[in-house]
Interface confidence: low
């Protein structure tokens, strides 16, 4: 004969277990249903009846299946320097993130709680370790036939180009002036060039990245310029 | 990191009031956690104090030697739990420690402590 | 409230020993129970929930077993960092958190 279905509530085996998506009510010592997800107990089980589940007020969610008395509270609205991902539903949290050009500088379970503006790397410097959703950028100086023009969060070291007659020599924030009318523009840094008569440093090897400053402690730092060697705009 | 940091703790006069404060970090403490109190006496055991629900208006519960003169609150945007309370006897002399604890079944209980905050009653 | 009742309050051992600490609930939590150690002047520290499962980082040598109102806490081979005192605790989840938290009375494990 098949094993009888037991229905909620039911006393389990000794030493047994409930089933999925049941508990073991302590005062019933009973196994006693669960509550899907965007519902929670309204009235825990007895011997004799079984767990009574309402459906979450609004602005509130249970994401499991639970036996919780109350559902939980969605988080606060998303802030202005935050884009909402996931709006608080039934069954779900309102998830916040950071807006394109700001990383999360204090994450949370999900989503984040601080956003903070990317590092901006001003002239003379350039990006060493782009930002992602959860570090700043990371500033270099730009090494020597390399420069940068920009303040900006994105932008690399980029080469001189290379003139056969200089008119200004190149520096970290500035371009080479050429006098000649066809300069040329060498492929990357650390690219071999053909023996051709320049008048500028032609040595573009990539320096080893600034080691990373911890993620999210850029926000607490004092507002004001930063010295040279951070290479960021303090802002 | 992760840590709850308690404080607050002091020298109280029998029948006096102490509020204690525990301020959450590292953490979403406005979402799925109870928060709860332990205390420890001197050189003796552990004992339950009460819990609140996530949610700013509880529900709260508590072990019956605590209920009329021990509250437990929470204020959500401050990260921060508190325990009030009143009356207090000699017998109150402990380590409060704060805890976190899970709100579904995950089985996280307990797993997350204070380093304790000394509450002496002594005339 | 639930009373929780531990056996011994304390005991002797030798590195290397077996050590075993009951627990007894004065009605059902069915396997709602957790284990901590605590050494003087720090906060408990989680071993074991759901009456036999492992909390995260603890070493293999300690296990917990049990169900109903009996439950044991098993140290295989004494170490010398387990000299301390362990505590069980009832914990039914939200639900059972109406009824309480009880922790039984302690076992001091000390070297012989």
């Known amino acids: 004969l098949p094993a009888q279905v037991a229905f909620t509530p039911y006393a389990p085996e000794p030493g047994g277990t409930c089933r999925l998506r049941e508990y073991y009510d302590q005062t019933a010592q009973m196994c006693c249903s669960k509550c899907p997800p965007g519902q929670h107990a309204k009235v825990f089980c007895t011997k004799t009846s079984d767990t009574v589940c309402d459906s979450c007020e609004d602005s509130t969610y249970t994401q499991l299946w639970n036996w919780v008395p109350e559902c939980l509270s969605c988080g606060s609205r998303c802030s202005s320097d935050q884009v909402e991902t996931q709006a608080c539903t039934r069954e779900q949290n309102r998830i916040c993130t950071c807006r394109p050009g700001w990383y999360c500088a204090l994450s949370k379970q999900e989503g984040c709680r601080l956003c903070a503006q990317l590092r901006k790397c001003r002239p003379g410097f350039g990006v060493a370790r782009p930002g992602t959703e959860t570090s700043d950028v990371v500033c270099k100086p730009c090494a020597p036939g390399t420069f940068s023009n920009t303040t900006s969060s994105t932008d690399i070291c980029r080469p001189h180009q290379i003139c056969h007659v200089v008119a200004i020599p190149g520096n970290a924030s500035m371009d080479a002036v050429c006098t000649s009318t066809s300069p040329t523009r060498s492929m990357a840094p650390g690219a071999v060039h053909l023996p051709q008569p320049v008048s500028t440093r032609s040595q573009h090897t990539q320096p080893t990245p600034a080691p990373s400053t911890a993620p999210g402690t850029s926000f607490l730092l004092p507002v004001g310029p930063s010295p040279p060697a951070e290479g960021s705009t303090g802002d | 990191e992760v840590q709850l940091v308690e404080s607050g703790g002091g020298l109280v006069q029998p029948g006096g009031s102490l509020r204690l404060s525990c301020a959450a970090s590292?953490?979403?403490?406005?979402?799925?956690?109870?928060m709860c109190w332990v205390r420890q006496a001197p050189g003796k055991g552990l004992e339950w104090v009460g819990c609140?629900?996530?949610?700013?208006?509880?529900?709260?519960y508590y072990a019956n030697w605590a209920k009329g003169r021990f509250t437990i609150s929470r204020d959500n945007s401050k990260n921060t739990l508190y325990l009030q309370m009143n009356s207090l006897r000699a017998e109150d002399t402990a380590v409060y420690y704060c805890?976190?604890?899970?709100?579904?079944?995950?089985?996280?209980?307990?797993?997350?402590w204070g380093q304790g905050t000394l509450v002496t009653v002594s005339s | 409230d639930i009373q929780m009742t531990q056996s011994p309050s304390s005991l002797s051992a030798s590195v290397g020993d077996r050590v075993t600490i009951t627990c007894q609930a004065s009605q059902s939590i069915y396997n709602y129970l957790s284990w901590y150690q605590q050494k003087p002047g720090k906060a408990p520290k989680r071993l074991i929930y759901?009456?036999?499962t492992l909390a995260s980082g603890v070493p293999s040598r300690f296990s917990g077993s049990g169900s109903g109102t009996d439950f044991t806490l098993t140290i295989s081979s004494l170490q010398p960092e387990d000299f301390a005192t362990y505590y069980c605790q009832s914990n039914s989840g939200v639900n059972g958190n109406r009824y309480g938290n009880a922790f039984g009375g302690g076992t001091k494990v000390e070297i012989k």
């Open positions: 759901y009456a036999s």
């Open positions: 590292g953490f979403s403490f406005t979402n799925n956690y109870y």
């Open positions: 609140i629900y996530p949610s700013i208006v509880g529900p709260t």
């Open positions: 805890v976190r604890d899970r709100y579904d079944d995950y089985g996280d209980y307990f797993n997350l």
